[in-house]
């Protein structure tokens, strides 16, 4: 069923990193337009990305509302020109998104080597905790305190001289680790949330090395 | 509103296992870690572990690994608590609770009723 | 295992302000540790007061308040009423546990 000379829309895809969500679908409109709505489970439908010929839609001002909701999206096809017409059962042909839960899938952008800093025999390495677009009390919340507990970051670190990597973890956003006196160290992190099934892993951050600008040496 | 309804007391045989359960309603039960906490008569609170009913992930206090395990079924958002070897010193109030989220906050803040368990021979 | 300890008992005067404190075993209490506060009344259970150091439950008056000063996880009182009469709990993350303090017991008199 639907309207002649439109079809529904397919291959729904949540892309979401950092909680910035888009959901993206298919095919290109020829002739028609669409209508993208977003609910909870329990909530009313709320339309967004009107009578758009996009084919994705930012639904992330609606979802950060509580990250922690499971949202289902639909798309409505209408044709273009008669955004008034409906299909043969009364409604517009729709197609529906699968769920998505931000909290346990939203992915983990790639994280940021703020600063390293060598004390004697330690490097103190700290992560950007990153902004996110959830907010509370008119303040952008940080990815660590959007997830807290659940997220850990893991550090890989290697002698510039060589190609041996060790690994560190951390609860917070700094490490503290032994090094060689007179070694030059590189870096990198990823953010990873242990607890999840789906997207638990970050991409790796960019490469740091010492001897270069971002970290502060002092000999003790 | 957020509501957590706890299963009824059991009085056990020392050896034995129980199953305590833990229905959840008002929220998204699959993103919020379920607690478990233990309070013996007269003493304190003891954390035993917590459950992310969408994941399945797990958490154990040392003290009760090998013996406690916990499960959820996100189908009737119930989670459950079975500790097996049941002994004298398992007589407590077993509570479920989680925590209130806002953006950020993380532990107990929604408790259930809680629920005796009597090990006695 | 990190041991967690607070005040066993402790008395205020109605209209007064307590301080309870958490301190750990394993050093300085810091956010990382999400400092939590619970309070227990006889026949009314358990209710959660602050949680991640200091974010009140929605129940929560604005005269309960959760901070760190210095090395301890503190809960602060301010104007306190009869009905705050309780035991209260504090509980701290340790990278992968919880662990909850023996609990003071508030009284008001």
């Known amino acids: 069923s639907g309207t002649t000379n439109t079809v529904a829309a397919y291959n729904l895809t949540w892309k979401s990193t950092n909680f910035k969500t888009i959901l993206e679908w298919e095919p290109k409109p020829v002739n028609q337009v669409y209508t993208v709505q977003i609910s909870t489970k329990s909530g009313d439908w709320k339309s967004k990305c009107f009578y758009t010929t996009d084919t994705e839609c930012d639904l992330t001002d609606e979802i950060v509302k509580d990250v922690k909701q499971t949202y289902l999206a639909r798309v409505f096809s209408y044709p273009a020109g008669n955004v008034e017409s409906t299909g043969s059962a009364g409604e517009p042909l729709y197609e529906n998104s699968p769920e998505f839960t931000p909290y346990l899938e939203t992915n983990l952008g790639q994280p940021t080597i703020q600063s390293f800093e060598q004390v004697g025999t330690k490097v103190n390495v700290t992560v950007e905790d990153e902004r996110t677009l959830v907010r509370r009390n008119n303040t952008f919340l940080s990815l660590r305190d959007v997830f807290g507990k659940d997220l850990i970051y893991t550090l890989y670190y290697w002698k510039s001289s060589s190609s041996g990597k060790k690994t560190a973890k951390t609860n917070t956003n700094e490490f503290l680790i032994d090094v060689d006196k007179g070694e030059n160290y590189c870096f990198s992190v990823q953010a990873v949330i242990p607890s999840r099934t789906v997207n638990r892993k970050s991409t790796d951050s960019p490469v740091e090395c010492m001897g270069q600008e971002k970290g502060e040496f002092r000999e003790i | 509103e957020v509501q957590l309804q706890q299963s009824g007391a059991e009085v056990m045989k020392p050896g034995a296992s129980v199953k305590i359960s833990c229905k959840a309603s008002?929220?998204?039960?699959?993103?919020?870690?379920i607690e478990w906490v233990k309070q013996a008569p007269g003493q304190g609170l003891e954390w035993i572990g917590e459950?992310?009913?969408?994941?399945?992930?797990?958490k154990y206090n040392e003290k009760f690994k090998g013996r406690v395990t916990f499960t959820a079924d996100t189908s009737t958002n119930t989670a459950y608590m079975e500790l097996s070897s049941l002994r004298s010193e398992d007589t407590a109030v077993y509570y479920c609770?989680?925590?209130?989220?806002?953006?950020?906050?993380?532990?107990?803040?929604?408790w259930g009723q809680g629920t005796l368990v009597t090990v006695s021979s | 295992q990190a041991v967690v300890t607070q005040e066993p008992s402790l008395t205020v005067s109605p209209g007064g302000t307590v301080t309870l404190t958490c301190r750990s075993s394993t050093g300085a209490v810091t956010t990382s540790n999400y400092a939590n506060w619970v309070q227990e009344k006889p026949g009314h259970g358990f209710k959660g007061l602050i949680s991640g150091t200091n974010n009140r439950g929605p129940w929560t008056t604005a005269r309960f308040s959760g901070s760190i000063l210095g090395d301890k996880a503190v809960l602060t009182l301010w104007g306190a009423h009869a009905e705050d009469e309780a035991d209260y709990f504090c509980a701290l993350w340790y990278s992968n546990h919880w662990v909850f303090g023996g609990g003071t017991k508030l009284t008001v008199l």
């Open positions: 008002g929220y998204t039960f699959s993103s919020y870690w």
């Open positions: 459950i992310l009913p969408g994941s399945a992930s797990t």
């Open positions: 609770a989680r925590d209130y989220y806002y953006g950020s906050s993380y532990g107990f803040a929604y």
